[in-house]
C-alpha cells in the first residue's frame, strides 16, 4: 500500500516495569504504543514470542486491547517457571517496529519446609540460651522473627538478639521458659517452624 503522509512508525509511549509477583496472583506488564496505522503488539520473553489467548484460548496470558500483557495467575513450579523472565513488547506497523525497555518478571516464593527447625534448649537461670533456625527458601529472602508461647517475642529486651536465624538470650530468666517458634516471612506470607521448648532450671 502507498505511504500516506499522516502515517508514522510505531513508538512506545508506556514501557513495562519490573515486577515481583506471588505465585498464583494476577499480574500485568504494561505496554502502550502509538503509530499510524495502529501498530500490532507482540510480547517476547528471552527472545521467544510469548503465546497469549490470541494463540490459545486456554492460555493464562491475555493480550489486552491496550497492548499490555495480563497474567490471569502467575504460574511457577518447582522446576517449570514459564512466566519468570525478561520481557519486551514489540510494536509493529508497515513503517517499522519499536521495542520496549526490558522488564523482568520475578516470582515471589516461600517454600513450606524449614531448612533447619529450632531444637529444645535447657539452661540454668542466668546462663545464655541460643536457638537457631533456617527458614524455608524464598524470594525475596524471608525475614526471621520469633514467637514465644504464640506471641511475637519482645526483641526490645536488650538481653535478646536476633541475628540471621539465631535467637540469643544473653542471660536467662525463669520467665523466658516456654515454647518458641521461628517465623519466616516475605510478601508471599509466613511459615512457622516446629516448636522448640526452652527450659530454664533453677540453680
Amino acid at each position: 500500500s502507498r505511504l500516506r503522509q499522516e502515517d508514522f512508525p510505531p513508538r512506545i509511549v508506556e514501557h513495562p516495569s519490573d515486577l515481583i509477583v506471588s505465585k498464583g496472583e494476577p499480574a500485568t506488564l504494561n505496554c502502550k504504543a502509538e503509530g499510524r496505522p495502529t501498530p500490532t503488539i507482540e510480547w517476547y520473553k528471552g527472545g521467544e514470542r510469548v503465546e497469549t489467548d490470541k494463540d490459545d484460548p486456554r492460555s493464562h496470558r491475555m493480550l489486552l486491547p491496550s497492548g499490555s500483557l495480563f497474567f490471569l495467575r502467575i504460574v511457577h513450579g518447582r522446576r517449570s517457571k514459564p512466566d519468570e523472565g525478561v520481557y519486551v513488547c514489540v510494536a509493529r506497523n508497515y513503517l517499522g517496529e519499536a521495542v520496549s525497555h526490558n522488564a523482568s518478571l520475578e516470582v515471589a516464593i516461600l517454600r513450606d519446609d524449614f531448612r533447619q527447625n529450632p531444637s529444645d534448649v535447657m539452661v540454668a537461670v542466668g546462663e545464655p540460651a541460643v536457638m537457631e533456625c533456617q527458614p524455608p527458601r524464598g524470594h525475596p529472602e524471608p525475614t526471621i522473627s520469633w514467637k514465644k508461647d504464640g506471641s511475637p517475642l519482645d526483641d526490645k529486651d536488650e538481653r535478646i538478639t536476633i541475628r540471621g536465624g539465631k535467637l540469643m538470650i544473653t542471660y536467662t530468666r525463669k520467665s523466658d521458659a516456654g515454647k518458641y517458634v521461628c517465623v519466616g516471612t516475605n510478601m508471599v506470607g509466613e511459615r512457622e517452624s516446629e516448636v522448640a521448648e526452652l527450659t530454664v532450671l533453677e540453680r
Epitope: K45, G46, E48, R49, V50, E51, D55, D56, V75, H76, G77, R78, R79, S80, K81, P82, D83, G85, D112, D113
Partner: antibody
Framework: EVQLVQSGAEVKKPGASVKVSCKAS????????MHWVRQAPGQGLEWMGW????????EFPQKFQGRVTMTRDTSITTAYMDLSRLRSDDTAVYYC???????????WGQGTMVTVSS | DIVMTQSPSSLSASVGDRVTITCRAS??????LNWYQQKPGKAPKLLIY???SLQSGVPSRFSGSGSGTDFTLTISSLQPEDFATYYC???????FGGGTKVEIK
C-alpha cells in the same frame, strides 16, 4: 494448539541404541521442563528423567544414569531421548511429557514403541 | 527415594458407583501429588494436580484430597468412559504409583 509429537516406532537389537524425538509446538519451549516416561507392556509408568530446554540441564534416576542421554534443539523446539546398551526389558512405549508450572505432566506425546529383540 | 503405594491394584465397579483410590507416599510430600487416567493404547491424561486441584476440562465428578503421606482420588459417580487405569505421581522426586485398574463389574 499445544502439542508434543513423537517419532515413529523402532525395532532394535540388544546392545544397540535408540534415539526418540519429541517435537513441541504451541508454547514457549524453553519455559517448561520436558520429561521422559516409559511403560513396558502391561506394566505401570516409569519416570526416566528430565531436561530443562532453557539450559540443557538434565536429571535422571539412578537406574538410568550412564545409559540415558537427553538433549534438545531449541531452534526446532525438539527434545531427544537416547537410550544405549538396549536390553529386551527396555521394550516399552516411551513418552515425552511437559511439566506445567503446577508441577504436573499436563501435555503428553502420543508415545513411541521401542521393541528390543534379537 | 520416595515410594508411592497405590491401592487397590484393581477394582470392579458399576456405572453410578462412588469409587475411591488411595495412594500413600513413603515420606511426606506435602501436596505435591498428581493423578492421571490412562486408557489402553493412549497416553496418560492429567486429572488432578497439587493433590486437589482439578485440571481444566476434567469433569467435576473427579476429586482429590490429602496431604503429607496419604492421598485419595474419588470418582463420585462412575461413568462408562471412566473405566481405565489410574496412577498417582509425586512431583518432588517424580515417581509413579503402581496403578489401579477400574473394571466393569
Amino acid at each position: 494448539e499445544v502439542q508434543l509429537v513423537q517419532s515413529g516406532a523402532e525395532v532394535k537389537k540388544p546392545g544397540a541404541s535408540v534415539k526418540v524425538s519429541c517435537k513441541a509446538s504451541g508454547y514457549t519451549f524453553t519455559g517448561y521442563y520436558m520429561h521422559w516416561v516409559r511403560q513396558a507392556p502391561g506394566q505401570g509408568l516409569e519416570w526416566m528423567g528430565w531436561i530443562n530446554p532453557k539450559d540443557g540441564d538434565t536429571e535422571f534416576p539412578q537406574k538410568f544414569q550412564g545409559r540415558v542421554t537427553m538433549t534438545r534443539d531449541t531452534s526446532i523446539t525438539t527434545a531427544y531421548m537416547d537410550l544405549s546398551r538396549l536390553r529386551s526389558d527396555d521394550t516399552a512405549v516411551y513418552y515425552c511429557a511437559r511439566e506445567s508450572g503446577d508441577d504436573a505432566f499436563d501435555i503428553w506425546g502420543q508415545g513411541t514403541m521401542v521393541t528390543v529383540s534379537s | 527415594d520416595i515410594v508411592m503405594t497405590q491401592s487397590p491394584s484393581s477394582l470392579s465397579a458399576s456405572v453410578g458407583d462412588r469409587v475411591t483410590i488411595t495412594c500413600r507416599a513413603s515420606q511426606s510430600i506435602s501436596s505435591y501429588l498428581n493423578w492421571y487416567q490412562q486408557k489402553p493404547g493412549k497416553a496418560p491424561k492429567l486429572l488432578i494436580y497439587a493433590a486437589s486441584s482439578l485440571q481444566s476440562g476434567v469433569p467435576s465428578r473427579f476429586s482429590g484430597s490429602g496431604s503429607g503421606t496419604d492421598f485419595t482420588l474419588t470418582i463420585s459417580s462412575l461413568q462408562p468412559e471412566d473405566f481405565a487405569t489410574y496412577y498417582c505421581q509425586q512431583s518432588v522426586g517424580l515417581s509413579f504409583g503402581g496403578g489401579t485398574k477400574v473394571e466393569i463389574k
